[in-house]
């Protein structure tokens, strides 16, 4: 029965059972609806646009980390359709706080204007 199907399941009228919605591959996101018992006939997977990535499954494409603009860090590896960007050391004029817990993205770099004296990234 339709109502018994889960978030990523549709009701297969041939078998009379709930069936898993086809997952998308890395670098893709679902297009149109599938789940809770129904599946659009044109349900499918579309590519992530530029600056976004997805690991596949039912995940929508998410923006790459903005290493330079948001984290004030260098780009170690630029992101592609399948992978997030990886950030490297801080940009010139910025430093990383030691002994600070990483946030969900990793370390954030702070302006040398706010740095304690003799912060190595900010000397010279």
């Amino acid at each position: 029965e339709y109502s018994n199907c889960g978030e990523n399941e549709y009701y297969n009228q041939t078998t009379g059972l709930c069936q898993e919605c086809p997952p998308c591959g890395p670098g893709e996101e679902p297009y149109l609806s599938c789940g809770y018992g129904t599946k659009d006939e044109d349900y499918g997977c579309v590519p992530c646009p530029a600056e976004k990535f997805s690991k596949g499954g039912y995940q929508i494409c998410r923006r790459h980390k903005d290493c330079e603009g948001f984290f004030r860090a260098t780009v170690l590896t630029p992101g592609d359709m399948e992978n997030d960007a990886e950030c490297g050391p801080c940009l010139p004029g910025y430093y990383m706080l030691e002994n600070r817990p990483r946030n969900i993205y990793g370390m954030v770099c702070y302006s040398c204007l706010l740095a304690p004296p003799n912060t190595k990234e900010c000397v010279g």
Epitope: P22, G27, E41, G44, C45, V46, P47
Partner: antibody, heavy 119, light 107 residues
């Protein structure tokens, strides 16, 4: 075995009608959306119609809307294109093409059938 | 409708050459770009889908790249069997549209 084979082409007078068929084999026809794409002599490819796997969704290009009808018979593994009010500019090679499962491109093409509209 | 433009309608190259065919969309198509090969006998085959993914059975000398409105198909080591016309196609917005084609010939 050829997965898609078109038939029904030929010479038609302007204003006339023609029905093209595309026989599918070697894959589960009822799982796939299907397209018609055409190519006028010495011109590029032109998408003209699409039908989803169970016929719920049907789309046409503006050039054929109201004149052409796409349909399918999943029991007979056959795709159709009913063409009416034909014009000289409809003269082309007509290809049927399969929509890849889950994705939005034409992954298998037939060899085409030629329609010539001329008096 | 989204217009797809292949500025080079014909291209002459030597066997073994690296050949690049370009395609431009009239608006951002977000990587919904596919490439097809049409042989002189009219046979059409999918080469590349979603900008850069090689369709099964297609030789690895074919590759695709691009984003936004600008895309390209590269053949790294041209072979005799690659003599054909190449079409780009956008699948982002109905109606799906093709470029005018680039005919590849041997010098």
């Amino acid at each position: 075995e050829v997965p898609l084979e078109e038939s029904g082409g030929g010479l038609v007078k302007p204003g006339g009608s023609r029905k093209l068929s595309c026989a599918a084999s070697g894959f589960t026809f009822s799982d796939h959306g299907m397209h018609w794409v055409r190519q006028a002599p010495e011109k590029g490819l032109e998408w003209i119609a699409y039908i989803s796997s169970g016929s719920s969704n049907v789309y046409y290009s503006d050039t054929v809307k109201g004149r052409f009808t796409i349909s399918r018979d999943n029991a007979k593994n056959t795709l159709f294109l009913q063409m009416t009010s034909l014009r000289s500019e409809d003269t082309a090679m007509y290809y049927c093409a399969r929509r890849e499962l889950l994705r939005f491109y034409f992954d298998v093409w037939g060899a085409g059938t030629t329609v010539t509209v001329s008096s | 409708d989204i217009q797809m433009t292949q500025t080079t309608s014909s291209l002459s190259a030597s066997l073994g050459d690296r050949v690049t065919i370009s395609c431009r969309a009239s608006q951002d198509i977000g990587n919904h770009l596919n490439w097809y090969q049409q042989k002189p006998d009219g046979t059409v085959k999918l080469l590349i889908y979603y900008t850069s993914r090689i369709h099964s059975g297609v030789p690895s000398r074919f590759s695709g790249s691009g984003s936004g409105t600008d895309y390209s198909l590269t053949i790294s080591n041209l072979e005799q069997e690659d003599i054909a016309t190449y079409f780009c196609q956008q699948g982002n917005t109905l109606p799906w549209t093709f470029g005018g084609g680039t005919k590849l010939e041997i010098k």
